[in-house]
Amino acid sequence: IWELKKDVYVVELDWYPDAPGEMVVLTCDTPEEDGITWTLDQSSEVLGSGKTLTIQVKEFGDAGQYTCHKGGEVLSHSLLLLHKKEDGIWSTDILKDQKEPKNKTFLRCEAKNYSGRFTCWWLTTISTDLTFSVKSSRGSSDPQGVTCGAATLSAERVRGDNKEYEYSVECQEDSACPAAEESLPIEVMVDAVHKLKYENYTSSFFIRDIIKPDPPKNLQLKPLKNSRQVEVSWEYPDTWSTPHSYFSLTFCVQVQGKSKREKKDRVFTDKTSATVICRKNASISVRAQDRYYSSSWSEWASVPCS
Amino acid sequence: RNLPVATPDPGMFPCLHHSQNLLRAVSNMLQKARQTLEFYPCTSEEIDHEDITKDKTSTVEACLPLELTKNESCLNSRETSFITNGSCLASRKTSFMMALCLSSIYEDLKMYQVEFKTMNAKLLMDPKRQIFLDQNMLAVIDELMQALNFNSETVPQKSSLEEPDFYKTKIKLCILLHAFRIRAVTIDRVMSYLNAS
């Protein structure tokens, strides 16, 4: 058993049929010694008396808010949560496996630049009685500070018969140099509590590996005289690290109709313009990627050909 | 401790081409190592990230773009003195700070070159003959060092009398390649910045 925060405790349980469970001793936070009784949640049934209460925690029915009272007055609370371990593996029931980039990916993180700011998100089908708490650091043995905000519900989607909820959090490394060469990864830890179930999820990464630039901005077309070719130009996204001559991007320019299976014109360039063949009912799209360290491509920025 | 916006001679800054080749060569070599050593811990997640140049050179700080010198987190207190007669830019226009940066890059390359050559000598003794260093990568390191053209004491190649542990050598190769790729990215960024200045 360990303390998650004040008056909230996590009991780690091996979860299998007829498991013996864990013996837990609760102590009432009071100078009083006599006349103390214990109850669980809203029940008025007295579970025991005395300054300490010893319980055998085996299942969710044994978890909850234990309260010690004296003469009708509440003295203190202890909330017990369960953390299940099945076949030596901690449960991951609360969050959905996003399976990208690999199986057992519960947290996904992205950074728009090298400033040390990044966003992580996760998915769940649970809509109520759900809380998240996020901590982060650079390295684990001698951790350096990363400050994370509160996790917020950022999107709701319908997937078949189920509703899916996306939560996200923004974090900022306290003293980040965009040009630095990372040797210690960022560690992100998410505590998830659903009703009386506790789970924790972690992710470890280098900012350089989670870079995904914003799409290029200000796409403009200039038809070339006596030709089907069009000169398309664009600019670096505002959110990208500066100077751009140091933090350079490379671009992919594509002309394609509405369907992915349609024919296309595609060219890669390090410049902020390119010449392509425009077709009726097609769109010109441009996306960006770090020129020197191949992490993710940005989303496409598009303009119609006509 | 940073790169001022200098005005190099017009035309292609000669080291830019070499640095692009360097990044390409080390990336290819790292990819080859990951594939060949698939049953060794050779991915970014599996290895310890070590920098053999730590406390010996300070390329990131010495080559910091002017725009980042206002960022407190980028200014490191480490001071290292470097030889200052580089030839990637016309000598008259090579400022002291830029020479400091380029000589730091040269020292990095020299250190990695020695490590790679020592390691290759060990890998050549491996009866499995599983992996060797790409000669192209070693040649590209050499070309960039020549383009930088710094005079510096030659570092003797480390020789070891004990029987090499090939497993450890291959893991060390992965660690070295990962670190060198990161440094090659920095070098490419620096050369691109200098070329645009």
Epitope: R228, T250, R261, E262, K263, D265, V267, F268, T269, R279 | -
Partner: antibody
């Protein structure tokens, strides 16, 4: 299976024209760009131009501009390349090629040898 | 027009050994570079697209690398069926242009 089948070999006199055909099978004809590339005996490859069969748009290499005409007939899934004012240096194997990507070729025809000789 | 220069023009190789062919562009073409294989009396066949993207059905011993002006086609271990002529082609701008070809011959 995508296939491009070209017309047979031709022998032409200098100053005349030649029209080579290329019939496509497998996949929708207008879903692909069609190119013509030639190869003189013992020489390398030379790109001549492309057509978008969907709308008839064409682009030619400056070297052939005014001498080459590429057309397409959607009803028969056939593309044509006509080269006029033939000279001896036009002796070559002419390939049609196609791809959903405009700028390179993932399938090429078997080639048509055009010999220009007096 | 962008000029593509291949080297060497002829490459004698022992079967089972690796082979590397170089292609250089007269100006930077990013990764807009494709490789083809042509055997005598046959049409060219696409091997690699956009400098390093493998093509389905092409053996994994063929790999490509490079960007900007310098590109390499590598055959990790030459098989008897790999003896052929190899061409690079740029798609950075029209007109599309090819290298002069590299003939890989049995040593």
């Amino acid at each position: 299976q995508v296939q491009l089948v070209q017309s047979g070999a031709e022998v032409k006199k200098p100053g005349s024209s030649v029209k080579v055909s290329c019939k496509a099978s497998g996949g929708t004809f207008s879903d692909y760009y069609l190119h013509w590339v030639r190869q003189a005996p013992g020489q390398g490859l030379e790109w001549m131009g492309w057509i978008d069969p969907e709308n008839g748009d064409t682009e030619y290499a400056p070297k052939f501009q005014g001498r080459v005409t590429i057309t397409a007939d959607e009803s028969t899934s056939t593309a044509y390349m006509e080269l006029s004012s033939l000279r001896s240096e036009d002796t070559a194997v002419y390939y049609c090629a196609r791809n959903k990507e405009l700028r390179y070729f993932d399938v090429l025809g078997q080639g048509t040898l055009v010999t220009v000789s007096s | 027009d962008i000029v593509m220069t291949q080297s060497p023009l002829s490459l004698p190789v022992t079967p089972g050994e690796p082979a590397s062919i170089s292609c250089r562009a007269s100006q930077s073409i990013s990764i807009n570079l494709h490789w083809y294989q042509q055997k005598p009396g046959q049409q060219p066949r696409l091997l690699i697209a956009f400098a390093s993207q493998s093509i389905s059905g092409v053996p994994s011993r063929f790999s490509g690398s490079g960007s900007g002006t310098d590109f390499t086609l590598t055959i990790s271990s030459l098989q008897p069926e790999d003896f052929a002529t190899y061409y690079c082609q740029q798609s950075n701008s029209f007109p599309l242009t090819f290298g002069q070809g590299t003939k890989v011959e049995i040593k």
